[in-house]
C-alpha cells in the first residue's frame, strides 16, 4: 500500500518565497514520520525535512542549506520557502514515510512542484545609474 | 518495445531561446515517424512537431503558438524554441512516434527537462524613467 | 520469491570493527523499512537497529548506540550495518528482517564473535 | 523503552494439547503486536501480526488475541512440527522490543 501526494502543478515565487502544501491520502495525527520536500527530476537535493512523531515538538531543517519552515495539518505538510534564488527553480517533489506504528508505509511518485522563482529584479534608481542586478 | 529517451534533467533560457535535445534508443534513418515536445506535468501542451518520412522533406509546427525548429539526427530530434516567456518556465517531454516500418514504437516516458526562461530583464534608461518590466 | 542474504560476520577483537551486509531480492526494497535482530547463543531475540524505506531515519538500541550505524544503497538493493567498538556481549547471530507490518521475512544470519 | 513480558518461560506439552502463551506490554500498544516461531538454528518466522492476523502460510490452529498490554497465542492443537520457540514483539512504537521468548518442548 502506499500514500498517495497530491501537489500543485506549478507556483511562482515572485518575492523569492513560496508556501508547498504537500497533501496525503493519510492521517498523521499521532504517528512518527518523516515528511521530506526534494528539488530535481531526480530528486537528487533533499531542500526540507519535517519530522515528528507523538512525544516530541515537530522537527524541521535542512542540511541543505535551505530556508524552510513546515506547518503540519492533518493529512498535510506544507513547507515554507524563503530566500530563493533564481536559479532553484526547478520540480520539487513531496515524500512521506510513515514508520510507526506499522505498517512501515511511503508514498506513490507525485507529479512534482515547479517552483518558479521570479525573485525580485532590481533596477538603478534614476538619480544614480549603475549596473542592474539580474 | 519502447523507445528509451534521454533528455537534459535542467536547461536555461537566458535569452528566450533554447536548444533541446531528445535522444532515442532507436535509429531514425528512413523512418516515418512523429517526433513531439509537450509542456507541463500532465504534458497537456504539444509544443511542437517533427514529423519526417523518407519521401518528403522534415515537417516542423507548432499548433499552440510556439515558435520553433526542428533538427534531425540518426537517433535524435533537437527542437530549437525562441521567443519564450518567463512564465512558460515548465517541464517538457520529448515524445516519438514511429509508424512504419511496423511494429508501430513509441517511447516510455521521459523524465522531461525543466526549461527554466530566464528572458531579458529590461531596465529603463536613467535618462528616460519609466517601470521596469518584471 | 523474497530472499534476504547476509555476510560479512566473522571473529573479531574487542574494540575492532566489521560491516555486515544483507541482500536482498523478490521485493522492491526502496519501499520497505528494513531491521537488524541479533541473538546472543542461547538468548532471545534483541532488535538492534532500524532503517526507512529511503534511508532517511534510522532507530537505534540504546545497547549499540554511537557504536553501530545502519545505512542502505537502494541502488544495489542492500542494507548494512556498521559496527565498530565492539565488545564481547556484540557476540551474536546477526539477521537482517524486512519490516512492514511485522518482521515479515528474515535472512538465515550471520555469526558475529567478539574474542580475544 | 516497552518491555514485553512473556509468561510461561517454558512449558512441556503433549501432541494434540490446547497451547497458550501470554505477553504483557509495559504500557499500551494497541494492537501492535506479533508472533514469531523460533526452531534451533533457524531464523525466527512470523506467525500473528496485529495482534490476531494469520501470515500467510501459517497453519490455522495458531491463533492470536488481545490489545493494549495484554496478548494471547494459542496452539489449537499442538503438532509435532510446533516443538520450537515462541517470541512476541511490538512495533507501535520505537524501538520495536521482543519477549524474552517461551520455550514449548516435549511432555
Known amino acids: 500500500n502506499k500514500i498517495l501526494v497530491k501537489q500543485s502543478p506549478m507556483l511562482v515565487a515572485y518575492d523569492n518565497a513560496v508556501n508547498l502544501s504537500c497533501k496525503y491520502s493519510y492521517n498523521l495525527f499521532s504517528r512518527e514520520f518523516r515528511a521530506s520536500l526534494h528539488k530535481g527530476l531526480d530528486s537528487a537535493v533533499e531542500v526540507c525535512v519535517v519530522y515528528g512523531n507523538y512525544s516530541q515538538q515537530l522537527q524541521v531543517y535542512s542540511k541543505t542549506g535551505f530556508n524552510c519552515d513546515g506547518k503540519l495539518g492533518n493529512e498535510s505538510v506544507t513547507f515554507y520557502l524563503q530566500n530563493l534564488y533564481v536559479n532553484q527553480t526547478d520540480i520539487y517533489f513531496c515524500k512521506i514515510e510513515v514508520m510507526y506504528p506499522p505498517p512501515y508505509l511511503d508514498n506513490e511518485k507525485s507529479n512534482g512542484t515547479i517552483i518558479h522563482v521570479k525573485g525580485k529584479h532590481l533596477c538603478p534608481s534614476p538619480l544614480f545609474p549603475g549596473p542592474s542586478k539580474p | 518495445n519502447k523507445i528509451l529517451v534521454k533528455q537534459s534533467p535542467m536547461l536555461v533560457a537566458y535569452d528566450n531561446a533554447v536548444n533541446l535535445s531528445c535522444k532515442y534508443s532507436y535509429n531514425l534513418f528512413s523512418r516515418e515517424f512523429r517526433a513531439s515536445l509537450h509542456k507541463g506535468l500532465d504534458s497537456a501542451v504539444e509544443v511542437c512537431v517533427v514529423y519526417g518520412n523518407y519521401s518528403q522533406q522534415l515537417q516542423v509546427y507548432s499548433k499552440t503558438g510556439f515558435n520553433c525548429d526542428g533538427k534531425l539526427g540518426n537517433e535524435s530530434v533537437t527542437f530549437y524554441l525562441q521567443n519564450l516567456y518567463v512564465n512558460q518556465t515548465d517541464i517538457y517531454f520529448c515524445k516519438i512516434e514511429v509508424m512504419y516500418p511496423p511494429p508501430y514504437l513509441d517511447n516510455e516516458k521521459s523524465n522531461g527537462t525543466i526549461i527554466h526562461v530566464k528572458g531579458k530583464h529590461l531596465c529603463p534608461s536613467p535618462l528616460f524613467p519609466g517601470p521596469s518590466k518584471p | 520469491e523474497v530472499q534476504l542474504l547476509e555476510s560479512g560476520g566473522g571473529l573479531v577483537q574487542p574494540g575492532g570493527s566489521l560491516r555486515l551486509s544483507c541482500a536482498a531480492s523478490?521485493?522492491?526494497?526502496?519501499?520497505?523499512?528494513m531491521s537488524w535482530v541479533r541473538q546472543a547463543p542461547g538468548k532471545g531475540l534483541e532488535w538492534v537497529s532500524a532503517?526507512?524505506?529511503?534511508?532517511?531515519?534510522?532507530y537505534y538500541a540504546d545497547s549499540v548506540k554511537g557504536r553501530f550505524t545502519i545505512s542502505r544503497d537502494n541502488s544495489k538493493n542492500t542494507l548494512y550495518l556498521q559496527m565498530n567498538s565492539l565488545r564481547a556481549e556484540d557476540t551474536a547471530v546477526y539477521y537482517c528482517?524486512?519490516?512492514?507490518?511485522?518482521?515479515?521475512?528474515w535472512g538465515q544470519g550471520t555469526l558475529v564473535t567478539v574474542s580475544s | 523503552d516497552i518491555q514485553m513480558t512473556q509468561s510461561p518461560s517454558s512449558l512441556s506439552a503433549s501432541v494434540g494439547d490446547r497451547v497458550t502463551i501470554t505477553c504483557r506490554a509495559s504500557?499500551?500498544?494497541?494492537?501492535?503486536l506479533n508472533w514469531y516461531q523460533q526452531k534451533p538454528g533457524k531464523a525466527p518466522k512470523l506467525l500473528i501480526y496485529a495482534a490476531s492476523s494469520l501470515q500467510s502460510g501459517v497453519p490455522s490452529r495458531f491463533s492470536g488475541s488481545g490489545s493494549g498490554t495484554d496478548f494471547t497465542l494459542t496452539i489449537s492443537s499442538l503438532q509435532p512440527e510446533d516443538f520450537a520457540t515462541y517470541y512476541c514483539?511490538?512495533?507501535?512504537?520505537?524501538?520495536?522490543?521482543f519477549g524474552q521468548g517461551t520455550k514449548v518442548e516435549i511432555k
Open positions: 523478490g521485493f522492491t526494497f526502496s519501499s520497505y523499512a
Open positions: 532503517i526507512s524505506g529511503s534511508g532517511g531515519s534510522t
Open positions: 504500557q499500551s500498544i494497541s494492537s501492535y
Open positions: 528482517a524486512k519490516r512492514y507490518i511485522a518482521f515479515d521475512y
Open positions: 514483539q511490538q512495533g507501535g512504537m520505537p524501538p520495536d522490543t
